[in-house]
C-alpha cells in the first residue's frame, strides 16, 4: 500500500459525505446504496463512521461530472478515466468525482428497475433466457399489449420471475398528467404521433400526450428513459433500439452480433436496417459504481495506489463479485486510522428499494411465446482498466486520478508516444505500452507496464526513439531525457544538456536523418541531433512546415515506421514519404484503425 506524502488523513473519525448530484444511468436509490456499501467496506475495518449529510460542508462531496467539471482535472469522455478523488483535507480535498460519460452499472450491464410483475421491483437480469433464447434488453416478445418486460433472474424459463421495464405505455414522469401513460396516437400541432417525440422542445426531452389530442387537452408527460436499449456509437447514438428489426432479411428481437467480426452487440434503431441503415451498439456491462466508488473513497481517506494487483487500490478496474478489500488495502487504511474496535461487524448487506404500489389497472400475467430463432448470448465485459498517471501536484498536496479501462490499445484515443523499436511498433500511454507487429489479423500485444521494463521512466512520455546502430533508446518527458542501453540507464538529463534552449518545453518526436543523425521535433520546430555526441546543432533549427509541408503544425508525436515519417495530431496521423529529397504527405489515417488494424466501430 501507499499513502500520500505526509500521510494525509482525516483527523476525526465521524466522516460525512454529500451526494451532490446523480447519474441518470442508475436509479437514485441504487446509487445511494452503492455509495453506502462502498463506505461500509472501509468502516468495517477501521474506527471510521460515515454519515450522509445534505450540504457542501461534508468532508467528502460526491459529484458526477463530464469533461471540465470545475476542478481543473477534466474527464475524457467514455472509457479512459473513470473517476478521480482528492486526498483528505478541506474544500475540494476529500472529494470524489465520477465521469458521467461512463455507463455506470453494478458491473453486470445496465440496471433496469422493474415495476409490477412478480419480482418485487427487482432489477432486470441481462442477459436472460426466455423460451430458449437469450435477451440482452427488455422485450415485448410473448405479449400482445406491447409492454416491454424482462426476467429478473438469468433464466425466465426455469425461475418464472419477471417485471415490466420503464415504458411510456406504463407511465410517464413529471409533466402535468399525474404519471398517466402515453396515449398513442396523439395529435400535436395538428399532426399525429405514434411514439414519444422531442418536437416542440429545445432541450431534447422525449414527451407524449396522455390523451388523444394534446392541442385540445394540453395534458402531457415525459417518457421514461430505457437504459437497456439506448444505443451508443454507430450512427444513431442516444436513440433506442427498435425490436424487432430486420437485418439481411431476418428478424431480430434482441441485440445481435451478427454481421460483426468482433462479437459486439448491436441493434437497429428503426424497424428495418436493410433499408434505413440506422444502428448503434447496445449498452455494455458498464462499470461497477460500487467498486469504483470503493476505490475512490480509499483515496479520499488517504490511500494512494497500491502495487498489489489484487488490491482494491490497484489502479486498474477489474470487476469482481468477491470481497473487494485485499489484506494490502486493510493494512493501508489501518496504518492511517488503526483497527476497528472489536467486535468485527458482519459484512454489509444490500437492500433493494421496494416498488411502489401498482395502479388499479396493471399489466397482466407473464409472457407466453414460441420464438423462431435463438440469438447470440449477452454482451461480454469491456476491456479491463489500465492505470493513468496522477496530474501534476498542486501547491500543497498531490492528487490522484485512478482507474482507466483502456487495456485494449484499440480503445486508446491518443497515445503519449509511438516508436519503432527493433522491428516492432511500441505504443506508450499512461505508464503502459503495447507492442505491434504488422501482419494479417495481428493485434497489439499488451498492455505491459513501462516500469517493469524501464523502471527509471516517468509514466507520461512525450516521445521515444531507437538509434539503430547503438540500439540506444531515448525517452523524452517534459524537459528531461533518459537514455537506455539494454538495462542500464543514463539520466534523467535536462534537455539543455543536449543543446536545446530553455524555451524548448518538450521533445515531441524524432526521425532518422542519415547515419548517426536524427531530427528532433518540438512543436513547430526541429533540430538535427548527433546521437554519438548527444548534442543538437543549434544552427540547424528549422520550421517543421518548411521541411514537411502539409503536416499539421500542432503535432503531439512524430515517429518513424517502415521508413516513413508519421506526424500525429489527435487520433490521426499524416504519413510522409521522401522521394528525391521531396517530403510529401501520402496518407492521412487513424492510428488505431489504419496502423494497428483495429476493427472499425
Amino acid at each position: 500500500f501507499q499513502t500520500f506524502e505526509g500521510d494525509l488523513k482525516w483527523h476525526h473519525h465521524n466522516i460525512t459525505y454529500w451526494i451532490q448530484n446523480y447519474s441518470e444511468d442508475l436509479p437514485r436509490a441504487v446509487i445511494d446504496d452503492a455509495f453506502a456499501r462502498a463506505f461500509a467496506l472501509w468502516s468495517a475495518v477501521t474506527p471510521l463512521t460515515f454519515t450522509r449529510v445534505y450540504s457542501r460542508d461534508a468532508d467528502i462531496v460526491i459529484q458526477f461530472g463530464v469533461a471540465e467539471h470545475g476542478d481543473g482535472y477534466p474527464f475524457d469522455g467514455k472509457d479512459g478515466l473513470l473517476a478521480h478523488a482528492f486526498p483528505p483535507g478541506p474544500g475540494i480535498q476529500g472529494d470524489a468525482h465520477f465521469d458521467d460519460d461512463e455507463l455506470w452499472s453494478l458491473g453486470k450491464g445496465v440496471v433496469v428497475p422493474t415495476r409490477f410483475g412478480n419480482a418485487d421491483g427487482a432489477a432486470c437480469h441481462f442477459p436472460f433466457i426466455f423460451e430458449g433464447r437469450s435477451y440482452s434488453a427488455c422485450t415485448t416478445d410473448g405479449r400482445s399489449d406491447g409492454l416491454p418486460w424482462c426476467s429478473t433472474t438469468a433464466n425466465y424459463d426455469t425461475d418464472d420471475r419477471f417485471g415490466f421495464c420503464p415504458s411510456e405505455r406504463l407511465y410517464t414522469q413529471d409533466g402535468n398528467a399525474d404519471g398517466k401513460p402515453c396515449q398513442f396516437p396523439f395529435i400535436f400541432q395538428g399532426q399525429s404521433y405514434s411514439a414519444c417525440t422531442t418536437d416542440g422542445r429545445s432541450d431534447g426531452y422525449r414527451w407524449c400526450a396522455t390523451t388523444a389530442n394534446y392541442d385540445r387537452d394540453k395534458l402531457f408527460g415525459f417518457c421514461p428513459t430505457r437504459a437497456d436499449s439506448t444505443v451508443m456509437g454507430g450512427n444513431s447514438a442516444g436513440e433506442l433500439c427498435v425490436f424487432p428489426f430486420t437485418f439481411l432479411g431476418k428478424e431480430y428481437s434482441t441485440c445481435t452480433s451478427e454481421g460483426r467480426g468482433d462479437g459486439r452487440l448491436w441493434c437497429a434503431t428503426t424497424s428495418n436496417f436493410d433499408s434505413d441503415k440506422k444502428w448503434g451498439f447496445c449498452p455494455d456491462q458498464g462499470y461497477s459504481l460500487f467498486l469504483v466508488a470503493a476505490h475512490e473513497f480509499g483515496h479520499a481517506l488517504g490511500l494512494d495506489h497500491s502495487s498489489v494487483p489484487e488490491a482494491l487500490m490497484y489502479p486498474m478496474y477489474r470487476f469482481t463479485e468477491g470481497p473487494p478489500l485485499h489484506k494490502d488495502d486493510v493494512n493501508g487504511i489501518r496504518h492511517l486510522y488503526g483497527p476497528r474496535p472489536e467486535p468485527e461487524p458482519r459484512p454489509p448487506t444490500t437492500t433493494t428499494p421496494q416498488p411502489t404500489a401498482p395502479p388499479t389497472v396493471c399489466p397482466t400475467g407473464p409472457p407466453t411465446v414460441h420464438p423462431s430463432e435463438r440469438p447470440t448470448a449477452g454482451p461480454t465485459g469491456p476491456p479491463s482498466a489500465g492505470p493513468t498517471g496522477p496530474p501534476t501536484a498542486g501547491p500543497s498536496t498531490a492528487t490522484t486520478v485512478p482507474l482507466s479501462p483502456v487495456d485494449d490499445a484499440c480503445n486508446v484515443n491518443i497515445f503519449d508516444a509511438i516508436a519503432e523499436i527493433g522491428n516492432q511498433l511500441y505504443l506508450f500511454k499512461d505508464g503502459k505500452y503495447w507492442r505491434f507487429s504488422e501482419g494479417r489479423g495481428s493485434r497489439p500485444q499488451g498492455p505491459f507496464l513501462i516500469a517493469d521494463k524501464w523502471p527509471a521512466l516517468p509514466r507520461k512520455l512525450d516521445s521515444v526513439f531507437e538509434e539503430r546502430l547503438s540500439k540506444k533508446l531515448f525517452f523524452f518527458s517534459g524537459r528531461q531525457v533518459w537514455v537506455y542501453t539494454g538495462a542500464s540507464v543514463l539520466g534523467p538529463r535536462r534537455l539543455d544538456k543536449l543543446g536545446l534552449g530553455a524555451d524548448v518545453a518538450q521533445v515531441t518526436g524524432a526521425l532518422r536523418s542519415g547515419r548517426g543523425k536524427m531530427l528532433l521535433f518540438s512543436g513547430r520546430r526541429l533540430w538535427r541531433f548527433d546521437v554519438k555526441a548527444q548534442m543538437v546543432d543549434p544552427r540547424s533549427a528549422s520550421e517543421v512546415d518548411r521541411m514537411f509541408p502539409g503536416v499539421p503544425l500542432d503535432t503531439h508525436d512524430v515517429f518513424q515506421y517502415r521508413e516513413k515519417a508519421y506526424f500525429c495530431q489527435d487520433r490521426f496521423y499524416w504519413r510522409v514519404s521522401s522521394r528525391s529529397e521531396l517530403n510529401q504527405v501520402d496518407q492521412v489515417g487513424y492510428v488505431t484503425y489504419d496502423i494497428l488494424q483495429c476493427p472499425e466501430d
Epitope: D71, G72, P90, G91, D203, G394, S396
Partner: antibody
Framework: EVQLVQSGAEVKKPGASVKVSCKAS????????ISWVRQAPGQGLEWMGW????????NYAQKLQGRVTMTTDTSTSTAYMELRSLRSDDTAVYYC?????????WGQGTTVTVSS | QAVLTQPPSASGTPGQRVTISCSGS????????VNWYQQLPGTAPKLLIY???HRPSGVPDRFSGSNSWNTASLAISGLQSEDEADYYC?????????FGGGTKVTVL
C-alpha cells in the same frame, strides 16, 4: 472570518492592461477555486473565468480567451486577474469569488473604468 | 454559449409568495445543478441557493429552490421588504459558467 479583499479602483486608457488582486483569508486557500465575475454598469453578472488554487489550472470564458490571465500566489493566498487590450466596454465592477459548489464568498469588488 | 433565461422583473406585496424561473435555451438545465444569487443594491452578490435546493447557513428558510426537466425555480415565501434585490441563476454548461440575465424583485 472567511473573506476576500480586492485591490482598489483603477482608471485605464483603452489598449492598456489592468491587474486586479484578491487576497483570501480565514480558510485554506489551496483547497478552493476562485472565479472572477464582472458587472458592467446597470447590467447583469458575467463570468470571466476560474482558477484552481489547488493546481493553478484555469478555465476562461471563450469571449475573453487571449485577453485574460488568472494566476495565484499560494504563499500570500492571493489570486490575480489581468485583462489586456482594454476597451470602453470593459468598464465594470470586477469581483473575485471563492468557488466550491457555488460562489459562496465574494470580494467587495474593484471598479475598473476604461476611458480615453 | 448557452443562455439562461429569467423574467426581467417580479413583484409582490409583503407576505406574498414570489417565484422566479430560470430556463436553459440550448442545454438541459434539469440535468445541471443550479445556484441562485441575491444582489442587494450597491453590494456584491450573495449565494442564496446552491445545488438546486440547498441553503447556505444564514439564509432564511423562506428562500427555496427546485430544478426539474428544463426549468429551475427560486421561490420566496413570505416576501419582506429587505428581499428587494436582483436575483441571478447560474449553472455550468460544457466547461463554462453561465449566469441568467437577472430578475429584479420589487416589494410593493
Amino acid at each position: 472570518e472567511v473573506q476576500l479583499v480586492q485591490s482598489g479602483a483603477e482608471v485605464k486608457k483603452p489598449g492598456a492592461s489592468v491587474k486586479v488582486s484578491c487576497k483570501a483569508s480565514g480558510y485554506t486557500f489551496t483547497s478552493y477555486g476562485i472565479s472572477w465575475v464582472r458587472q458592467a454598469p446597470g447590467q447583469g453578472l458575467e463570468w470571466m473565468g476560474w482558477i484552481s488554487a489547488y493546481n493553478a489550472n484555469t478555465n476562461y470564458a471563450q469571449k475573453l480567451q487571449g485577453r485574460v490571465t488568472m494566476t495565484t500566489d499560494t504563499s500570500t493566498s492571493t489570486a490575480y486577474m489581468e485583462l489586456r487590450s482594454l476597451r470602453s466596454d470593459d468598464t465594470a465592477v470586477y469581483y473575485c469569488a471563492r468557488d466550491y459548489y457555488g460562489m459562496d464568498v465574494w470580494g467587495q469588488g474593484t471598479t475598473v473604468t476604461v476611458s480615453s | 454559449q448557452a443562455v439562461l433565461t429569467q423574467p426581467p422583473s417580479a413583484s409582490g406585496t409583503p407576505g406574498q409568495r414570489v417565484t422566479i424561473s430560470c430556463s436553459g435555451s440550448t442545454f438541459n438545465i434539469g440535468s445541471n445543478t443550479v445556484n441562485w444569487y441575491q444582489q442587494l443594491p450597491g453590494t456584491a452578490p450573495k449565494l442564496l441557493i446552491y445545488s438546486d435546493s440547498h441553503r447556505p447557513s444564514g439564509v432564511p428558510d423562506r428562500f427555496s429552490g427546485s430544478n426539474s426537466w428544463n426549468t429551475a425555480s427560486l421561490a420566496i415565501s413570505g416576501l419582506q421588504s429587505e428581499d428587494e434585490a436582483d436575483y441571478y441563476c447560474q449553472a455550468w454548461d460544457s466547461s463554462a459558467v453561465v449566469f441568467g440575465g437577472g430578475t429584479k424583485v420589487t416589494v410593493l
